[in-house]
Amino acid sequence: FERTRSLQDPCSNCPAGTFCDNNRNQICSPCPPNSFSSAGGQRTCDICRQCKGVFRTRKECSSTSNAECDCTPGFHCLGAGCSMCEQDCKQGQELTKKGCKDCCFGTFNDQKRGICRPWTNCSLDGKSVLVNGTKERDVVCGPSPADLSPGASSVTPPAPAREPGHSPQ
């Protein structure tokens, strides 16, 4: 089949990194600068991706493979192949239409990306709050109040590292 295809289509002999040049009697010509072909038999080369602005080059373009971008420090990739760069925020914040904003009271974000999420409601699981939540950390749920009744083995909660986060907007 390959042999038959080659006889029918001379372009099928052109390897990756070249294109079948119709202007030159279907000779295999190397891809011009800043372009590539990742498969054989191509009639054109694709333009290399350019990593500009907040995008930085992770892998240079070659004649056979496209450039790969990631994000400059302070940003992180979104989408397939890092098609977008989103600004980081600090822990305890989320990215809003007004930039990075502190999590509202009762919510937290322990990452530099994503949204503030509500603290766990310990009482829904019949438990009590062992360590208060902050803007950066979820609450820690402890034993249920019934488990702490007189006679039951008591748990001394560790002192919270800081006051509960409070950031009314």
Epitope: R49, C51, F55, S83, L95, T96
Partner: nanobody, 122 residues
Framework: EVQLVESGGGLIQPGGSLRLSCAAS????????MSWARQAPGKEFEWVSS???????YYVESVKGRFTISRDNAKNTLYLQMSSLRAEDTAVYYC????????????????WGQGTQVTVSS
């Protein structure tokens, strides 16, 4: 060919004012959302301000009330009026298209200028 060319940067004393311009060509400026970003020496890139084609504006908290983004569609030009400048505003300022329409988020297909240096120092 798309081009974004920033100008208007320079050395300015604290408390002073500057107006940055970004001349756009090669695309339909009037229907494009645009933004400014900056990078201070040794610091990370930071989104500064964005403007929709409608004229709606957004600013990072640290420049709110001091910087004003605007556009002149007849001149295909984006502006950043900067006043009450502080030492911490020292950076290279970049003009860019803003296809995501999401604050602090840029797409790989966005275009960027080469930047203009703003130095705030006495």
């Amino acid at each position: 060919e798309v081009q974004l060319v920033e100008s208007g940067g320079g050395l300015i004393q604290p408390g002073g004012s500057l107006r940055l311009s970004c001349a756009a060509s090669g695309f339909t400026f009037s229907s494009s959302a645009m933004s400014w970003a900056r990078q201070a020496p040794g610091k990370e890139f930071e989104w500064v301000s964005s403007i929709y084609s409608s004229g709606k504006t957004y600013y990072v908290e640290s420049v709110k009330g001091r910087f004003t983004i605007s556009r002149d569609n007849a001149k295909n030009t984006l502006y950043l009026q900067m006043s009450s400048l502080r030492a911490e505003d020292t950076a290279v300022y970049y003009c860019a298209t803003w296809k995501t329409l999401r604050v602090g988020v840029w797409d790989e297909s966005d275009y960027w200028g080469q930047g203009t240096q703003v130095t705030v120092s006495s």
